[in-house]
Interface confidence: medium
């Protein structure tokens, strides 16, 4: 059972864990929610005690039944992990705690101008978990305006207290707004050398990865797969880190593996979800209960649905036996990864997906104008909408892509002679116009966000948001698109595809069904040889065949430019402008998402 | 065919700066490794500092460590050496090297520039 | 660090000759060695990868062997284009990538 509420002076008894320190009970809950055992918490404000160091403490608990006795006890606030919710769970926390101190090791101390310039520096510095900044009225006159860059082994406060004109808060990498590197390469055949921060047993390099981007000490990692000669350390995973922030040395090692955190990158790629399942495999841990069912994708489906359960190890039925039903067994650790891994016992493995909900939706797996396009099939680009306009008759305006669950992403150009939201409807998980009638379900435009800087789409800027008047709720036709990730600057996209209900020829109509066309990027340099009276700026993305035959046309703009990378789709680019269509030697240009990456940060999270 | 061309190299006095520049072509540059590897008058080779294919990690070595810095800029294919605080033991012809291969091999060498660091 | 030492420092042979030099790591790289040959003036060129594999193009009288801490290049019949500095790498434990302090081949 899904409880979101907090329970004021209200304390839970007993089934302690862990006890950390965190600012509020909002944030103790956030914790809980991410530990892999905690199912309740009890978090003590200032007025719970007399004895400050016991302020601000955030106690999370465990219980078989998954309740606790409740007692009255004035200050306290109580409430339940979000693992038994269904709804998205983040690790972001934006908030600036007022005359907070909270205690870590102070590794770095400059000046600053603001809190906000505090936190920036925080989220940009590998090892910041969170900081305090000392305002201009703070009375001792040496450390105003300092900032104070903080770590800890657990990533939360060693203590929290109170200290007037200083302002603390945390690290927003787990908001996808860091803009250090992001490393998504595996290296074969390599171990790193540099301190081992922990260790735990994975069933291969990928999950390790996930586990390393999930501890806040670890920066990089290195994996010793089943073909390790030592077999004591076969799938084993050891989480890193140095000082430097990078590993001072690689050695070869065969049948080892190595490879970077992706905390600077967690919402662009799933980080949480270990959805595969491990054939051959047993997992072993401490059992929660077995149960006879068919097939190790329903033993899946049982310990995703049991709050407590980590992982299984599913045993297949013996012939003709049981009504072809194997036994699920249900397990769970301390750190939630299986405490030894065996192979060769025919056994089928894997992990609970309860967790698949803190990674942003917009990595979920998908099914497996458009000049020389073909048409889509339904639920192939559940990003894609098509915007209409009522006046003077209801058309198709533009595309857009879903960014989140009240935001479209799409061209500025696109509102040229559109005087107010009223007149628009967003229609989302359309295949065919032709699935538009008077009755068909829209989305209400709330408001128009254009870039402030938008004069014309050929001098960029041609980018905006529209906000819905409701929430989408997601599912497999209707889901977001990632925004690229600010450290996938160098990333090299292969596989981008233009999609939209745009013309087909220079002079055509509106296409019925969504078309789809595979095209290359084009270097910028490329691109402005190609428009010589026209600055390509590195704010547009350029994408076409040499040849031409393939290009967005009128209609499919502000629909998406999509990448693949990594398994993930990230809108890369916004359908903006271009010389006719599918010209030979005239790519479509593009608005390039990652130039705006904050400026859409910041009017979807004002 | 692939080839890489060394530039920037001459005579400098001791604490000044240099950049060296190495263009890279005939192969995918933004894919691979590149190092710097110098070597003095009459002497072996030394390895000076490399930079991954993507720009993210950087690394040198314990002589030049403060003082070089590597960098490169994939859209144009080349490779950097930002050398500050030159001293004479700096003296050298430095080469740019990469790893195209799937060994870690130098399967590729520029012709390598001089230095000279003298007053 | 990881050293190299070549040996020996310089040797004199013949047209035809066999011709071996070694090189010592100071700790096992099991087969993680590279050796290349320099002409005066010229920028290195590998030769053999991975302690016994050719690079291609290099002719097939140039061989290698060895693992972990000793290692081996053999020229089987030595010609006039042979002449020329020798020098095996380590890319086992990197960085710092450390070379030998070369061979200096001469004719007798």
């Known amino acids: 059972e899904c409880v979101t509420r907090l329970f004021k002076d209200i304390h839970f008894e007993g089934g302690d864990i862990a006890t950390v320190f965190t600012p509020s009970a909002k944030h103790c809950q956030v914790v809980c929610t991410h530990h892999p055992r905690c199912l309740l918490f009890t978090f003590t404000g200032e007025s719970a005690s007399e004895d400050p160091t016991q302020w601000f403490t955030c106690v999370l608990k465990d219980s078989v039944t998954e309740t606790l006795p409740r007692v009255n006890r004035t200050g306290a606030i109580s409430g339940y992990s979000f693992k038994q919710c269904s709804h998205q769970i983040s690790a972001c926390n934006k908030d600036i705690y007022v005359d907070l101190n909270m205690k870590g090791i102070n590794y770095n101390s400059s000046l600053a101008e603001s809190a906000q310039e505090c936190q920036e520096r925080c989220t940009d510095d590998v090892h910041c978990h969170f900081f305090t900044y000392a305002t201009r009225q703070f009375p001792s006159l040496e450390h105003r305006n300092i900032c104070l860059l903080k770590h800890t082994q657990t990533g939360t406060p060693t203590g929290i207290m109170k200290l007037d004109k200083v302002v603390t808060g945390f690290s927003l990498k787990s908001c996808a707004l860091s803009n250090l590197a992001c490393i998504r390469d595996v290296f074969p055949n390599t171990a790193f050398a540099d301190s081992n921060i922990d260790s735990v047993m994975a069933p291969d390099a990928f999950v390790c990865r996930r586990i390393c981007t999930h501890h806040p000490g670890c920066l990089f990692f290195t994996f010793f797969s089943q073909e390790w000669p030592k077999e004591s350390q076969r799938n084993l995973c050891l989480l890193k880190t140095s000082e430097s922030g990078l590993p001072s040395t690689r050695i070869k090692k065969s049948k080892a593996l190595s490879g970077f955190s992706l905390q600077s990158c967690r919402h662009s790629i799933p980080v949480f979800c270990h959805s595969s399942f491990y054939h051959d495999t047993d997992f072993l841990g401490e059992e929660l209960d077995i149960v006879a069912v068919k097939g190790h994708e329903a033993c899946q489906k049982l310990c995703t649905n049991a709050v407590r359960c980590q992982f299984f190890t599913y045993a297949p039925a013996q012939a003709s036996c049981n009504e072809g039903k194997g036994k699920c067994y249900l397990k769970l650790s301390s750190n939630g990864s299986p405490t030894k891994i065996l192979r060769g016992t025919g056994g089928i493995s894997g992990y609970t997906l309860r967790l698949c909900k803190m990674d942003n939706e917009c990595t979920t797996k998908i099914k497996p104008r458009i000049v020389g396009g073909t048409a889509s099939v339904r639920g192939e680009w559940p990003w894609q909408v098509t915007l209409h306009t009522t006046s003077p008759t209801q058309r198709h305006l533009c595309g857009g892509s879903i960014i989140g669950n009240q935001w479209i992403l799409t061209a500025a150009h696109c509102f040229y002679g559109v005087e107010s939201p009223k007149i628009l409807r967003v229609y989302i998980g359309i295949l065919n116009q032709s699935e538009i009638k008077e009755d068909t379900s829209f989305f209400g435009v709330q408001e128009i966000i254009i870039h402030d800087q938008y004069k014309m789409a050929e001098s960029g800027y041609d980018i905006a948001l529209l906000k819905l008047e409701t929430t989408v709720n997601y599912t497999d036709s209707q889901r977001p698109i990632c925004l690229p990730s600010k450290g996938d600057r160098n990333v090299i996209y292969t596989d981008c595809w233009v999609t939209g209900w745009g013309y087909r020829k220079l002079r055509d109509k509106i296409q019925n069904t969504l078309q789809k066309a595979k095209i290359p990027l084009v270097t910028n340099d490329e691109c402005q040889k190609r428009y010589r009276g026209h600055k390509i700026t590195h704010k547009m993305i350029c994408a076409g065949y040499r040849e031409g035959g393939k290009d967005a046309c009128k209609g499919d703009s502000g629909g998406p430019l999509s990448c693949k990378h990594n398994e993930v789709w990230h809108l890369v680019g916004i359908t903006s402008w271009g010389e006719g269509c599918a010209q030979r030697e005239r790519p479509g240009v593009y608005t390039n998402v990652l130039e705006y990456v904050d400026w859409i940060l910041e009017k979807t999270q004002a | 065919q692939v080839q890489l061309v060394e530039s920037g190299g001459g005579v400098v006095q001791p604490g000044r700066s240099l950049r060296l520049s190495c263009a890279a072509s005939?192969?995918?540059?933004?894919?691979?490794?590149m190092h710097w590897v110098r070597q003095t008058p009459g002497k072996g080779l030394e390895w000076v500092a490399l930079i991954w294919y993507d720009g993210s990690n950087k690394y040198s070595g314990d002589s030049v460590k403060g003082r070089f810095t590597i960098s490169r800029d994939n859209s144009k294919s080349t490779l950097y050496l930002q050398m500050n605080s030159l001293t004479a033991e700096d003296t050298a012809v430095y080469y740019c090297?990469?790893?195209?291969?799937?060994?870690?091999?130098?399967?590729?060498w520029g012709q390598g520039t001089m230095v000279t660091v003298s007053s | 660090d990881i050293q190299m030492t070549q040996s020996p420092s310089s040797l004199s042979a013949s047209v035809g000759d066999r011709v071996t030099i070694t090189c010592r790591a100071s700790?096992?790289?099991?087969?993680?060695l590279n050796w290349y040959q320099q002409k005066p003036g010229k920028a290195p060129k590998l030769l053999i990868y991975?302690?016994?594999s050719l690079q291609s193009g290099v002719p097939s009288r140039f061989s290698g062997s060895g693992s972990g801490t000793d290692f081996t290049l053999t020229i089987s019949s030595l010609q006039p284009e042979d002449f020329a500095t020798y020098y095996c790498?380590?890319?086992?434990?990197?960085?710092?990538?450390?070379f030998g302090q070369g061979t200096r081949l001469e004719i007798k």
């Open positions: 090297t990469g790893i195209t291969g799937t060994e870690d091999a130098f399967d590729v």
């Open positions: 991975a302690a016994s």
């Open positions: 700790q096992s790289i099991s087969s993680y």
């Open positions: 790498q380590q890319s086992y434990s990197t960085p710092p990538i450390t």
């Open positions: 005939g192969f995918t540059f933004s894919n691979y490794e």
